[in-house]
C-alpha cells in the first residue's frame, strides 16, 4: 500500500509541477517594473519569455513579441532552452510513469518493468524539475545584475551631473511560479525513486527453486502463495523465492480476460 | 458625447477652503482617470493629481500635496477638487480632464473653474 | 521633475506657410517596453480648454486635420503644421505624460500675419 501511495504521490505531485512549469513559461511577469519607490512613471513594464507587456494607467495593455531570434540575449535563449528541455522531459516522464503506475494494469506486465518504467520517469522529473529551477535561477541571476548595474547608473550618470530615471526591473510571478513548480517536479520525482525501490524484487541469496515430482514436474509460482517474509515459524510449509519479501499490497493477482487495462 | 461640466467662477476669501466640481457624462465614469489641472491667468499648464474613480486611487503632484485633495463621487458620477488655505498664489483656472483609454493623454478637458481668491 | 522646453515662442507666420515648433524634454520619454514615447501636443485657442492633437508623440487624436504632424524620439519632438491656417491661431504645449509628476512646456503661441 505505502508503495502505491508513494507511486501515486509522486506523480500527482510531478504532474503539477510540470503544469507549473509549463504556466510559468508562458506567463508575462518573468521580471516586472520594480515600483519600490513609488511608480515614477505613468505605464507599467513587465517581460516574459517571449513578448514583453507595458500596461498604461487606463488599465490598456499592449504585448509585443520578441520576433527575433538572433538579437536576443544569449542568456535568454538559455533560459527558453532549460523550460523547454524541462517540459520535454517532464511530458515524457509523465506518459512513462502513467504506465509504470501500479494501480493500471497493462497485459501482464512484470513488477520489475514497472519498477524500471517507475525510475525512468523519476529520473526524468528530478531532471525536468532542475532545468527548471535553473533556468528560472539563471533569469533571475540576470535581473540582480541588471538591477545593481542601473542603481549605480542612476547616481553615477555623466559624472553626477545628470540624474537618470531609469526603469528597474525586478522579479515577476512566474519566477516564483518556476522555482516551486521545479521544486514540486523534482520532489514527484524522488517519490517515483523510492517507489520503484519499493517495486523492484529485492534480490536475495536464494534463487527460485524448481521442485521436481517423482511424476511430474512442478513449477512453483510465487502467486499461488500469501506473501512471506520466508523467515521465523512455519517456513517448510512454504517456499522462498526471489524477492519473497513483499508487502500485502504487493500480492499479484494475474489479469483474466475480465480485467481492463 | 463626453461632457466635462464645470462651474464657471468661484470667489473665496484668503485662507479659506473651495471645492471644484466637475461632472461627468457621455461615457463610464470609472473607467478612466480623471485629471485636474492648474492655470494661471496669461501663464502655462500645471498638473496637480488625477484619481480613478473605480476604487478612488490617485496620485498627486508633490508641489500640490496638501493643498489639493481629489475626491469622487460615484452615484453622481462627479469628480471634486478641494483646495485648502487658499493664497492669491491660488487664484487661476482649474480644469478636470478625462484621461484617454490607450495613451496617458488628456482626451477630454471641461470648461474650466476660474477661482479667485480675494479679500 | 522632468522638464519640458518648448520654442520658438511666439511664432509669428504667414497663412499656408510651413511651421515647426520643438519641444526638447530633460529626459528621454522613450519607453523601451513598447517603443514609444510619452509625449502629448495640445493646442489651446483663446477662452477655451485645451485640446488633444496628437499623442504619442506622432499619432493624431481622431477628428485632427492631418496638416499636423507629430515626430521625435527620446528627448526632442517636433509639431508641424504643413499649411498654417487662420483657426491654427493658437498656443501649443507638450506634454509629458511618462513620468510623475505630468509636466508641460510652456508653451508656443502661434500668430498668423
Known amino acids: 500500500m505505502a508503495v502505491t501511495a508513494c507511486q501515486g504521490l509522486g506523480f500527482v505531485v510531478s504532474l503539477i509541477g510540470i503544469a507549473g512549469i509549463i504556466a510559468a513559461t508562458c506567463m508575462d511577469q518573468w521580471s516586472t517594473q520594480d515600483l519600490y519607490n513609488n511608480p515614477v512613471t505613468a505605464v507599467f513594464n513587465y517581460q516574459g519569455l517571449w513578448r514583453s507587456c507595458v500596461r498604461e494607467s487606463s488599465g490598456f495593455t499592449e504585448c509585443r513579441g520578441y520576433f527575433t531570434l538572433l538579437g536576443l540575449p544569449a542568456m535568454l535563449q538559455a533560459v527558453r532552452a532549460l523550460m523547454i528541455v524541462g517540459i520535454v522531459l517532464g511530458a515524457i516522464g509523465l506518459l512513462v510513469s502513467i504506465f509504470a503506475l501500479k494501480c493500471i494494469r497493462i497485459g501482464s506486465m512484470e513488477d520489475s518493468a514497472k519498477a524500471n518504467m517507475t525510475l525512468t520517469s523519476g529520473i526524468m522529473f528530478i531532471v525536468s524539475g532542475l532545468c527548471a529551477i535553473a533556468g528560472v535561477s539563471v533569469f533571475a541571476n540576470m535581473l540582480v545584475t541588471n538591477f545593481w548595474m542601473s542603481t549605480a547608473n542612476m547616481y553615477t550618470g555623466m559624472g553626477g551631473m545628470v540624474q537618470t530615471v531609469q526603469t528597474r526591473y525586478t522579479f515577476g510571478a512566474a519566477l516564483f511560479v518556476g522555482w516551486v513548480a521545479g521544486g514540486l517536479t523534482l520532489i514527484g520525482g524522488v517519490m517515483m525513486c523510492i517507489a520503484c525501490r519499493g517495486l523492484a524484487p529485492e534480490e536475495t541469496n536464494y534463487k527460485a527453486v524448481s521442485y521436481h515430482a517423482s511424476g511430474h514436474s512442478v513449477a512453483y509460482k510465487p502467486g499461488g502463495f500469501k506473501a512471506s517474509t520466508g523467515f521465523g515459524s512455519n517456513t517448510k510449509n512454504k517456499k522462498i523465492y526471489d524477492g519473497g519479501a513483499r508487502t500485502e499490497d504487493e500480492v499479484q493477482s494475474y489479469p483474466s480476460k475480465h480485467d481492463y487495462v | 458625447q463626453v461632457q466635462l461640466q464645470q462651474p464657471g467662477t468661484e470667489l473665496v476669501k484668503p485662507g479659506a477652503s473651495v471645492k471644484v466640481s466637475c461632472k461627468a457624462s457621455?461615457?463610464?465614469?470609472?473607467?478612466?482617470?480623471m485629471h485636474w489641472v492648474k492655470q494661471r491667468p496669461g501663464q502655462g499648464l500645471e498638473w496637480i493629481g488625477r484619481i480613478r474613480p473605480s476604487d478612488s486611487d490617485s496620485n498627486y503632484n508633490q508641489k500640490f500635496k496638501g493643498k489639493a485633495t481629489l475626491t469622487v463621487d460615484k452615484s453622481s458620477d462627479t469628480a471634486y477638487m478641494q483646495l485648502n488655505s487658499l493664497t492669491s498664489e491660488d487664484s487661476a483656472v482649474y480644469y478636470c480632464?478625462?484621461?484617454?483609454?490607450?495613451?496617458?493623454?488628456?482626451?477630454?478637458w471641461g470648461q474650466g473653474t476660474l477661482v479667485t481668491v480675494s479679500a | 521633475d522632468i522638464v519640458m522646453t518648448q520654442s520658438p515662442s511666439p511664432l509669428t507666420v504667414t497663412a499656408g506657410e510651413k511651421v515647426t515648433m520643438t519641444c526638447k524634454s530633460s529626459q528621454t520619454l522613450l519607453n523601451r517596453g513598447n517603443q514609444k514615447n510619452y509625449l502629448t501636443w495640445y493646442q489651446q485657442k483663446p477662452g477655451q480648454p485645451p485640446k488633444l492633437l496628437i499623442y504619442?508623440?506622432?499619432t493624431r487624436e481622431s477628428g485632427v486635420p492631418d496638416r499636423f504632424t507629430g515626430s521625435g524620439s527620446g528627448t526632442d519632438f517636433t509639431l508641424t503644421i504643413n499649411s498654417v491656417q487662420a483657426e491654427d491661431l493658437a498656443v501649443y504645449y507638450c506634454q509629458n505624460d511618462y513620468f510623475f509628476p505630468f509636466t508641460f512646456g510652456s508653451g508656443t503661441k502661434l500668430e498668423i500675419r
Open positions: 504619442w508623440a506622432s
Open positions: 457621455g461615457y463610464t465614469f470609472t473607467t478612466y482617470w
Open positions: 480632464a478625462m484621461g484617454a483609454y490607450f495613451s496617458n493623454s488628456f482626451a477630454y
